[in-house]
Amino acid sequence: PEDPSDLLQHVKFQSNNFENILTWDSGPEGTPDTVYSIEYKTYGERDWVAKKGCQRITRKSCNLTVETGNHTELYYARVTAVSAGGRSATKMTDRFNSLQHTALKPPDVTCIPKVRSIQMIVHPTPTPIRAGDGHRLTLEDIYDLSYHLELQVNRTYQMHLGGKQREYEFFGLTPDTEFLGTIMICVPTWSKKSAPYMCRVRTLPDRT
């Protein structure tokens, strides 16, 4: 038998905010005319399901967000590569659970400067996951999350705020001064931290 890695490598899910994309690389003997077909299934199911729109494709990614949309379920996907010469190789992912494996993007935040304070409003982060009634769930609906906010005052001093609410305000700031704010989503039960959202804002001049 030939080594499947010659045609196909690194089959894995890349998941951000519950958008689940299957990606892979061609092996050293893969060519631009190698075609790829994708199947997926849930834990313990016998039959693999062919993903429509990802059969005999030449690109090296396939969006499986809809097919892997139950965030309590375990999924697998597998890719079969077929070269122009008729050689084939199949590889599968490890078990994938979006609740556990998705990475969190930076939150969407509005930073509002005032004279002696900076207000930060965190907006709910939508996901592709839908509730029973069809509406899209936010990260807050899915996780017991909190927000961690930091304001860099100078090189040696930072102010910190945190909690589950969406509105925060750093008080006691100097007017007409630039500050760097960093806001992250934290999910302690899953040991997750989002990439940070950063805003550089200047407090308003004191006109009094």
């Epitope: 309590t72 379920e73 992912t93």
Partner: antibody
């Protein structure tokens, strides 16, 4: 037709090592999970662990972790069970079995006897 | 670890009669994602490897005669052979795949009376 064939069993002294092989045919070993299960003479079945042959990711029964190692050679379409520090109580028929939850195809098994 | 306990340890049934094997798990095997039970049944004849009969507690494996059926939910499960045939003489095992490590019952030996 899917077939699994184990080999490498035999008599080994206590404290010794053995490597069992499981040659898969009729499908690509990287297309499904592979497990090792053992059965002591006249006893029940005991799950040792599993491997995703595509990624090499393994999960073990804690009872065997550290002494037993599961691996795969994709180019040979073969899975392996490396067994170290063998004891008399490891005497059993060792099976490889396919799938990720329950086991749809089994090899015929290979007998390992640990005795001085 | 989830402990699987089968009863009886052995069973003698007349040809054509019903054989019932029970399997009890130390915790629920109901998988919340699909509301199915993560339990399989195997048949093992002397000198042979186990053969998959039933998965998801009640789904019959392809090629398995329909006299074999599985039922139950949660922690209590049953394998029924509706009309015992001579070729059904074997040891039967249940197995849970709810969590690691996967575990088996101790086996039930079915003989002809």
């Amino acid at each position: 037709e899917v077939q699994l064939v184990e080999s490498g069993g035999g008599l080994v002294q206590p404290g010794g090592s053995l490597r069992l092989s499981c040659a898969a045919s009729g499908y690509s070993i990287t297309a499904e999970y592979m497990n090792w299960v053992r059965q002591a003479p006249g006893k029940g079945l005991e799950w040792i662990g599993e491997i995703n042959p595509s990624t090499g990711t393994t999960t073990y029964n804690q009872k065997f972790k550290g002494r037993f190692t599961i691996s795969v050679d994709q180019s040979k379409n073969t899975a392996y069970l490396q067994m170290n520090s063998l004891r008399a109580e490891d005497t059993a028929v060792y099976y490889c079995a396919r799938f990720d939850a329950y086991f749809d195809y089994w090899g015929q098994g290979t007998l390992v006897t640990v005795s001085s | 670890d989830i402990v699987m306990t089968q009863s009886p340890d052995s069973l003698a049934v007349s040809l054509g009669e019903r054989a019932t094997i029970n399997c009890k798990s130390s915790q629920s095997l109901l998988y919340s994602s699909n509301q199915k039970n993560t339990l399989a049944w195997y048949q093992q004849k002397p000198g042979q490897p186990p053969k998959l009969l039933i998965y998801w507690a009640s789904s019959r494996e392809s090629g398995v005669p329909d006299r074999f059926s599985g039922s139950g939910s949660g922690t209590d499960f049953t394998l029924t052979i509706s009309s015992l045939q001579a070729e059904d003489v074997a040891v039967y095992y249940c197995q849970q795949y709810y969590s690691y490590p996967f575990t088996f019952g101790q086996g039930t030996k079915v003989e002809i009376k």
